[in-house]
């Protein structure tokens, strides 16, 4: 029986050219996390496997950094980074948990007014 829940940063906005941390947290379960996939719509951004560690897609290597923890840091943001991001937690013995984050990348002047959505 799956008892866990995924908490995410939810809907966030960030400034063009800036950085943002995509963070998911699995709680209310003692299941072992065997792998986390970070996906953006139809693309695999990164995988963190308990046995193999991190692997980042070459397409994003210059702009994506692993961590903190099982999160993902996106750098040098562009408007094209706007969209849905998914953290997919594969666990033993529970199975799979999925979290969703919507990121909106704004032009600098607009982002200043939406600063309340920024991650410190």
């Amino acid at each position: 029986m799956m008892t866990g829940t995924i908490e995410t940063t939810g809907n966030i906005s960030a400034e063009k050219g800036g950085s943002i941390i995509l963070q998911c947290h699995l709680s209310s379960t003692t299941a072992q996390v065997t792998q986390v996939n970070w996906e953006q719509q139809d693309q695999l951004l990164a995988i963190c496997n308990a046995d193999l560690g991190w692997h980042i897609s070459p397409s994003f290597k210059d702009r994506v950094a692993p961590g903190p923890g099982l999160g993902l840091t996106l750098q040098s943001l562009t408007v094209n980074d706007t969209g849905e991001y998914f953290c997919i937690y594969h666990t033993y013995p529970d199975g799979t948990y999925t979290g969703r984050i919507f990121l909106e990348v704004l032009e600098s002047s607009v982002a200043e007014h939406g600063a309340r959505f920024q991650i410190p």
Partner: nanobody, 115 residues
Framework: EVQLVESGGGLVQAGGSLRLSCAAS??????MGWFRQAPGKEREFLAI???????LYADSVKGRFTISADNAKNTVYLQMNSLKPEDTAVYYC???????????WGQGTQVTVSS
Amino acid sequence: EVQLVESGGGLVQAGGSLRLSCAASGRTYYAMGWFRQAPGKEREFLAIITDGSKTLYADSVKGRFTISADNAKNTVYLQMNSLKPEDTAVYYCAAQFTLARHLVWGQGTQVTVSS
């Protein structure tokens, strides 16, 4: 018992192609990957494919190697083109199976690229 069986290795001339296969018996996987280890070197990650057919490659092989899956046969392939002598190594597949604690590794298949 879950097993991975690799095949398709062999001797090929530089510039040639090979297709490796990795057949998984028994269980469904949510990620399968290919790795290689040359003599005296560390194991190197090459490519991984998820159960949703999303792929991720190492810089060293992107554009030359292609990972794909036949879910009906529970088999993952590595198509290797434009092979170079430095691609000579033992190639291993690994699978993260659903509801399993750790990766399962295949026994490896030798690939030798002659100049």
